[in-house]
């Protein structure tokens, strides 16, 4: 997150970290069910661990943390590497979470976002770009949903209805390492960090997010079929 600020503790209990061993964070994810996460399809790895209820980036033990293995990762069948359409994936955890103030699911919004909607994006991704500098704790940033026209103008011939753009002033954006993390609008999960320009936070080059309102049926049906 570029030019965000430290999230208040306990305010993002659905935020998950996807870790490669030993403790290397490579993507964010979102708890949407007691045993299921959503993340970006481009975050798929065969071997990874899931950390929930953790505030700092470092692997230091925190009393609220819960660790999991992913037993199944199900990318949206319409995703195409290295493209950006349908960039979402469900991950089934090896057990159900223990609900606490630090670990709790969020509902996926069935309403598509309208321009001007205020949202919050969070993650442990780099706080500088093109340099790489990772934060000590989870970062939060307020962003606004842009109209689909402004989105298409920013990225001609690259935007479809499985994506939406959001941003703030130049210099504020999600970035590498935030992928798969949540965009929360009006208390519901509206999007996942998907892609954007490089370096991040360039003028008139907003962040692009997976438009989850288009996938509520797939999410529900996939969880039911694999539970």
């Amino acid at each position: 997150i570029i030019n965000g600020s430290d999230c208040d503790m306990h305010t993002q209990p659905w935020q998950a970290a996807l870790l490669l061993r030993p403790n290397q964070l490579y993507c964010g994810a979102v708890l949407v069910h007691p045993q299921w996460l959503l993340t970006a399809a481009h975050c798929r790895k065969k071997v990874f661990r899931v950390r929930l209820g953790h505030y700092s980036l470092s692997p230091v033990y925190e009393s609220g943390q819960q660790m999991f293995q992913g037993v199944k990762s199900i990318p949206h069948p319409g995703y195409s590497h290295p493209g950006h359409s349908n960039d979402l994936m469900l991950i089934k955890l090896n057990r159900r979470i223990r609900p606490t103030k630090d670990v709790r699911p969020i509902n996926v919004s069935s309403h598509c976002p309208s321009a001007g909607t205020k949202c919050l994006v969070s993650g442990w991704g780099t706080t500088k770009s093109p340099q790489v500098h990772f934060p000590k704790v989870l970062q939060c940033l307020n962003i606004s949903v842009l109209s689909q026209k402004r989105c298409e103008d920013a990225y001609p011939r690259q935007i479809d209805d499985t994506m939406f753009c959001a941003g703030d002033k130049a210099g504020r954006d999600s970035c590498q390492g935030d992928s798969g993390g949540p965009v929360v609008c009006n208390g519901s999960l509206q999007g996942l960090v998907s892609w954007g320009d490089y370096p991040c936070a360039r003028p008139n080059r907003p962040g692009v997010y997976t438009n989850l309102c288009k996938f509520t049926k797939w999410i529900q049906e996939t969880i039911q079929a694999n539970s």
Partner: antibody, heavy 117, light 110 residues
Framework: EVQLQESGPGLVKPSGTLSLTCAVS????????MSWVRQPPGKGLEWIGD???????DYASWAKGRFTISQDSSKNQVSLKLSSVTAADTAVYYC???????????WGQGTLVTVSS | AYDMTQSPSSLSASVGDRVTITCQAS??????LAWYQQKPGKAPKLLIY???TLASGVPSRFKGSGSGTDFTLTISSLQPEDFATYYC????????????FGGGTKVEIK
């Protein structure tokens, strides 16, 4: 050097049990999923199953119940056990490492197992 | 069922030819497809993963493309060392799978 080496008996009697070992060197099992694949003489590759560092195991539908995949991280080895073998289980058996992006990037040389009395 | 069908099962070609092998999945596997080359008496070798990403040390004459259900391996100019059998493998799911591999395509000298 990153290397996999399968070992086990070259000949097994029908209805017997086959046990194969894959010795892993050059990388820790804790970081990778491992696969077992077999190839009957003159035929194609057949996926048997995968084992993950967490000891989660996926088997091909036809392999469930007959094959058992396990690992010993302290010895850095993966094992494959097959009960009630028949002539149809005659094959070259390979272990392989997944590169974490769903491609098998390191393979053992394979070990030929013949089922015959 | 996610069955993988390769075609052709064999083909004859000459050095310098452009060769195309196809792999079809019975359901969408997105981009989780790998290609392997196997020579007689040897273990398979990874050529391409994620449908189009070239594995380390693989010559650029090998190219993978496709997504969803239809995938292609193209060898732009066949070299003597390319005569071998090629297999595709899906990595989309391991659930209720008979085989993750396609049946193979043998590339022979014309």
């Amino acid at each position: 050097e990153v290397q996999l080496q399968e070992s086990g008996p070259g000949l097994v009697k029908p209805s017997g049990t086959l046990s194969l070992t894959c010795a892993v060197s050059g990388f820790p099992l804790s970081n990778y999923a491992m696969s077992w694949v077999r190839q009957p003489p003159g035929k194609g590759l057949e996926w048997i199953g995968d084992i993950y560092p967490s000891d989660i195991i996926d088997y091909a539908s036809w392999a469930k119940g007959r094959f058992t995949i396990s690992q010993d991280s302290s010895k850095n080895q993966v094992s494959l056990k097959l009960s009630s073998v028949t002539a149809a289980d005659t094959a070259v058996y390979y272990c392989a490492r997944d590169n974490n992006d769903y491609g098998l990037d390191i393979w053992g040389q394979g070990t030929l197992v013949t089922v015959s009395s | 069922a996610y069955d993988m069908t390769q075609s052709p099962s064999s083909l004859s070609a000459s050095v310098g030819d452009r060769v195309t092998i196809t792999c079809q999945a019975s359901q969408s596997i997105s981009s989780w497809l790998a290609w392997y080359q196997q020579k007689p008496g040897k273990a398979p070798k990874l050529l391409i993963y994620l449908a189009s990403t070239l594995a380390s040390g693989v010559p650029s004459r090998f190219k993978g493309s496709g997504s969803g259900t239809d995938f292609t391996l193209t060898i732009s100019s066949l070299q003597p060392e390319d005569f071998a059998t090629y297999y595709c493998q899906q990595g989309y799911t391991n659930s209720n799978i008979i085989n993750t591999f396609g049946g193979g395509t043998k590339v022979e000298i014309k």
